[in-house]
Interface confidence: low
Amino acid sequence: KETAFVEVVLFESSPSGDYTTYTTGLTGRFSRAGATLSAEGEIVQMHPLGLCNNNDEEDLYEYGWVGVVKLEQPELDPKPCLTVLGKAKRAVQRGATAVIFDVSENPEAIDQLNQGSEDPLKRPVVYVKGADAIKLMNIVNKQKVARARIQHRPPRQPTEYFDM
């Protein structure tokens, strides 16, 4: 399981007249459910239950976004509509270029994502936990426009980073 280097850029326009970018670097792991590839896109937060909806007319986004899903404690969803892997597949079917799972509340999901699938997704499926997950969800919960850049190596030079 390789380390996924995730750079999240929160991007907003302030009334004072400046674009403000906040960059947060965090690490996760590429799971065996997906490919070990770089990916980049606008973050779309998805509720785990939102991925249950089978109506393809709903919750469709333009291609190229990064889905972020905070998994609930298993006790809160004893009979999930889809496995974690199924949720990742559903997100990719809807146009996600990558999926990031916060597994802090559901560490069992790590094993589910790493069970060697015969047909892994062609897009990266990353999981984060602990402090990295807290940082990620803190940004996502701001409901601002944000981008995630996922790499399978650390950014090579400072110029690859957005300014803090």
């Epitope: 302030s14 400046d18 674009y19 980049e40 690859e160």
Partner: antibody
Framework: QVQLVQSGAEVKKPGASVKVSCKAS????????MHWVRQAPGQGLEWMGI????????SYAQKFQGRVTMTRDTSTSTVYMELSSLRSEDTAVYYC??????????WGQGTLVTVSS | DIQMTQSPSSLSASVGDRVTITCRAS??????LAWYQQKPGKAPKLLIY???SLQRGVPSRFSGSGSGTDFTLTISSLQPEDFATYYC?????????FGGGTKVEIK
């Protein structure tokens, strides 16, 4: 598909105001800030400002501060740009354009505003 | 304000030529740079964002590179529909600013 449809051409006298509308469809209106960019005849592109449809916050270019007002109506997914104290050099095509993390990915068809006495 | 200087201001080229347009920012803008194509009487069209990312639906003959202050738009093999004016634009800080444009004409 994403569409930004602007109001029709306007002819105004110097000193008057003009209000251009831009109706968005095909995406979640609140999720994407909207820019206004203008282009004088035969000239380049000039950024005027941006509005965040979610909260209504705005950011204007210094050049237009005090003369431009950008508003939005979330019930109709429409943004508005009003420019006051018009002068002949404000004659231009005015575009609304959707922001997607720094780039402007969709543009309206443009509204020609002519300022002439 | 960040000044964006584009060069050349115009160029003549033939179908099949490789065309390169450069854009220089007056200060570092990381990769907050986009390239647009505009044809007479039409709205600009996004080609490249984040300096090097190709917008969906744009032909792969268009490519962008650069970071910091110096950026390049390359058209690998010019097609008849590519004759237009091209603009770079920074979104690192407000006010957003555009380059003066490069008009690509038929030789």
């Amino acid at each position: 598909q994403v569409q930004l449809v602007q109001s029709g051409a306007e002819v105004k006298k110097p000193g008057a105001s003009v209000k251009v509308s831009c109706k968005a469809s095909g995406y979640t209106f609140r999720r994407y800030p909207m820019h206004w960019v203008r282009q004088a005849p035969g000239q380049g592109l000039e950024w005027m400002g941006i509005i965040n449809p979610s909260g209504g916050s705005t950011s204007y270019a210094q050049k237009f501060q005090g003369r431009v007002t950008m508003t939005r109506d979330t019930s109709t997914s429409t943004v508005y740009m009003e420019l006051s104290s018009l002068r002949s050099e404000d004659t231009a095509v005015y575009y609304c354009a959707r922001d997607k993390v720094g780039a402007i990915d969709y543009w309206g068809q443009g509204t020609l505003v002519t300022v002439s006495s | 304000d960040i000044q964006m200087t584009q060069s050349p201001s115009s160029l003549s080229a033939s179908v099949g030529d490789r065309v390169t347009i450069t854009c220089r920012a007056s200060q570092g803008i990381s990769n907050y740079l986009a390239w647009y194509q505009q044809k007479p009487g039409k709205a600009p069209k996004l080609l490249i964002y984040a300096a090097s990312s190709l917008q969906r639906g744009v032909p792969s003959r268009f490519s962008g590179s650069g970071s910091g202050t110096d950026f390049t738009l390359t058209i690998s093999s010019l097609q008849p529909e590519d004759f237009a004016t091209y603009y770079c634009q920074q979104s690192y800080s407000t006010p957003l600013t555009f380059g003066g444009g490069t008009k690509v004409e038929i030789k």
